[in-house]
């Protein structure tokens, strides 16, 4: 209460000060500054608290993106999109909300995290949970059997996110999927190649891609004695092995999910194994697992996959990990997940994962769920966890104290003397029309120092300075902000000179 009274007093004092300055006909700049102060004080005072208790914030699990964060985000997206396009993908978009029915029964235990919308004119709607189910719906609806597409958009999950670790309720996904009937494992291998290309290009640290197969998991559960009805729920327990110990996972399976302890132990013998193609070959010799048709198919495909991954030169980044059991119901074949590795404290220690940054797999049955005749369209895809990547890139840039440009302005149109606003407006317009990214300060007579300072702060590389003499001579002074070197450039050559200096193509084709 005392604080509000103090602020009210300051608002009153500042109001008097502004009025006094106006009466004294003080400089416009001083009045402008003091008015700005008054407005800031009033903003802090806000509405009377007795009238309003509203706290101004973004909803839980969401955030705004500052220009700096957007600059980081655009760089990350650029790397991802260029890779997707390099691999021949088309782009699509789908509505942010879907019919509730479309999303139901596709996510298993995660369905509780779907956001339902209030009644919208009779239709029961939900916000999309991922981009894969809407893609399958799109394929079925448009009777498509063959497409390679990418889709970058926001998805929504009613999670309890740890936002500091790059987890949110509203977040971007960057998906790449290949739909169609092709020879085994070729599209799957390309998806893994794309994942590795993107993570390498982003330079966010060393990573490992864990690979498994849903059929191997299901076969393993079957031979261990897990009933069909418990497959999915046991899967979600096994999937926690990257975060918690086997003991905790076993306790959950036995204590919460009603699995017999000896069944859990049998599962434990398998899911704690990981390795390369040699582990695939070892399991192909496993007397029990090799007798299971599903598991055998899965292992055969993985053997083939490793051959292709070797040809793509990424086999060193891939680990066959039997504990990988991605929680989504729709996977039917190969599944994979990329994790960043923390450098081990001691040589010879196991690399330590710091969370998934990309994931995906094969889902051959999802499109069929939407087709009245149950016609299947085999699909395989991947999703890049860009929110976590944004967080990592932001932290890295902060640690390096790197200055990030938040605009792409190439040149500031400045004046060295007063009364040159018209000339600045004419010149900036000429530059815009020629495709040059240009700005000017919104003041009639800005000080040259302020204009140069603005360039330094905004990272603008060039200043085009107009002066009385330059106007007479038909030249513009072009100044490099970093080197401070100035040259007179003929007005008709200015566009070309700016393009040359900023490495922009000379025509805007």
């Amino acid at each position: 209460m005392a604080e509000r009274a103090a602020l009210e007093e300051l608002v009153k004092l500042q109001g008097e000060r502004v009025r006094g300055l106006k009466q004294q006909k003080a400089s416009a700049e001083l009045i402008e500054e003091e008015v700005a102060k008054l407005l800031k004080l009033k903003a802090q005072l806000g509405p009377d608290e007795s009238k309003q208790k509203f706290v101004l914030k973004t909803p839980k699990g969401t955030r705004d993106y500052s220009p700096r964060q957007m600059a980081v985000r655009e760089k990350v997206f650029d790397v991802i999109i260029r890779c997707f396009k390099r691999h021949g993908a088309e782009v699509i978009d789908t509505p942010v909300f879907e019919l509730k029915e479309t999303l139901m029964g596709k996510y298993g235990e995660d369905s509780k995290l779907i956001y339902d919308l209030k009644d919208q004119g009779g239709e029961l709607l939900s916000l999309r949970y991922d981009l894969t189910v809407p893609f399958a719906r799109y394929l079925a609806m448009n009777k498509l059997t063959n497409i390679k597409r990418y889709h970058i958009a926001k998805v929504y999950r009613r999670d309890n996110p740890a936002m500091t670790r790059g987890r949110y309720r509203e977040f971007y996904q960057c998906d790449f999927d290949i739909a169609g009937n092709f020879d085994p494992m070729i599209p799957d291998a390309e998806c893994l190649k794309i994942m590795c290309e993107i993570l390498s290009s982003l330079q966010i640290g060393d990573f490992l891609v864990k690979v498994n197969d849903r059929r191997i998991l299901d076969g393993m559960f079957a031979i261990c004695g897990v009933s069909d009805s418990k497959f999915r729920t046991i899967c979600s327990s096994v999937d926690k092995l990257d975060k918690v110990s086997w003991e905790e996972v076993k306790n959950e399976m036995v204590g919460e999910k009603g699995l017999a302890p000896e069944v859990a132990d049998r599962i434990g013998d398998y899911v704690q194994q990981h390795g390369g193609v040699s582990l695939v070959e070892q399991l192909l010799q496993d007397p029990k697992l090799s007798q299971n048709k599903q598991a055998l198919e899965g292992l055969g495909d993985l053997k083939l996959l490793f051959e292709y991954l070797t040809l793509f030169g990424i086999d060193d980044k891939i680990s066959f990990d039997l504990s990988l059991a991605r929680g989504l119901d729709y996977y039917t074949g190969v599944i994979y997940e990329a994790v960043l590795l923390q450098t081990p404290a001691q040589a010879g220690e196991e690399p330590l994962g710091v969370g998934s940054v990309a994931a995906g797999g094969r889902y051959d049955g999802l499109v069929g769920m939407f087709d009245p005749k149950g016609r299947k369209v085999p699909c395989v895809g991947l999703s890049i966890g860009v929110e976590r990547i944004f967080s990592i890139v932001e932290q890295r840039l902060e640690a390096l104290e790197e200055k990030i440009r938040t605009t792409e302005t190439q040149v500031l149109v400045a004046s060295a003397q007063k009364k040159l606003l018209e000339e600045r407006l004419k010149l900036v317009s000429e530059l815009w029309d020629a495709g040059i990214k240009a700005e000017l300060l919104y003041k009639k007579n800005p000080k040259l120092l302020n204009q140069l300072q603005y360039c330094e702060e905004a990272g603008i590389p060039l200043v085009a300075i107009i002066g009385e003499q330059e106007l007479k001579d038909g030249v513009i002074k072009l100044r490099s902000v970093t080197s401070r070197e100035e040259v007179d450039v003929r007005r008709e050559d200015l566009v070309e000179e700016i393009k040359r200096r900023t490495g922009q193509p000379l025509c805007i084709c």
């Epitope: 103090a6 602020l7 007093e9 300051l10 004092l13 500042q14 008097e16 000060r17 700049e29 500054e33 700005a36 102060k37 800031k40 004080l41 802090q44 300072q453 702060e457």
Partner: antibody, heavy 120, light 107 residues
Framework: QVQLVESGGGLVKPGGSLRLSCAAS????????MTWIRQAPGKGLEWVSY????????DYADSVKGRFTISRDNAKNSLYLQMNSLRDEDTAVYFC?????????????WGQGTLVTVSS | DIQMTQSPSSVSASVGDRVTITCRAS??????LAWYQQKPGRAPKLLIF???SLQSGVPSRFSGSGSGTHFTLTISSLQPEDFATYYC?????????FGQGTKLEIK
């Protein structure tokens, strides 16, 4: 926690230069006017310079005008004072401080100070 | 520039005493006045702003009054931690100026 930490002080010869930094944490730095205030050994306080939150406004005491430059980097939550053509009488502890209620020229949060000694 | 003059320049007092320090401005500054406390080797600490508003976290034994050109800082009952130098500062117009300080010592 909410704090200001200065650095960059030291011994410099008359005519020399020095750049002071002030790292802010625990508050929305870009909302606040910031200031440099100095205190000569055993003497009182002197307001040196200020800068507005958005970098739009700055001013300097007559004693330092043309020699000192105040600046800030809101992305790095940092305030700076570039001191050129230093004189003996610039010897002081330099404090950075935050304006009370963002815009009122009264320091409600101060750093611990950094000593600048100008001597031949 | 607005000159700020504090009196006395030093004062001796005992724990429990009531102490008043005065500050005069060379021209009217309305209520644009602050009081600070500074201990040796430390940064100043804001006590009062807008002539009479108590900064949050400052004990209520400190109070300020005045307007225009004449201001006072009062400590109603001195505590051992109050022995320090006190400065007034005008925030009416730049350059913002401080008084020369009042040293409060133990009697």
């Amino acid at each position: 926690q909410v704090q200001l930490v200065e650095s960059g002080g030291g011994l410099v010869k008359p005519g020399g230069s020095l750049r002071l930094s002030c790292a802010a944490s625990g508050f929305t730095f870009s909302d606040y006017y910031m200031t440099w205030i100095r205190q000569a050994p055993g003497k009182g306080l002197e307001w040196v310079s200020y800068i507005s939150g958005s970098n739009a406004y700055t001013d300097y005491a007559d004693s330092v005008k043309g020699r000192f430059t105040i600046s800030r980097d809101n992305a790095k939550n940092s305030l700076y004072l570039q001191m050129n053509s230093l004189r003996d009488e610039d010897t002081a502890v330099y404090f950075c401080a935050r304006y009370v209620y963002q815009v009122v020229a009264i320091g409600d949060l101060w750093g611990q100070g950094t000593l600048v000694t100008v001597s031949s | 520039d607005i000159q700020m003059t504090q009196s006395p320049s030093s004062v001796s007092a005992s724990v429990g005493d009531r102490v008043t320090i005065t500050c005069r401005a060379s021209q009217g500054i309305s209520s644009w006045l602050a009081w600070y406390q500074q201990k040796p080797g430390r940064a100043p600490k804001l006590l009062i702003f807008a002539a009479s508003s108590l900064q949050s976290g400052v004990p209520s034994r400190f109070s300020g009054s005045g307007s225009g050109t004449h201001f006072t800082l009062t400590i109603s009952s001195l505590q051992p931690e109050d022995f320090a130098t006190y400065y007034c500062q005008q925030a009416k117009s730049f350059p913002y100026t401080f008084g020369q300080g009042t040293k409060l010592e133990i009697k």
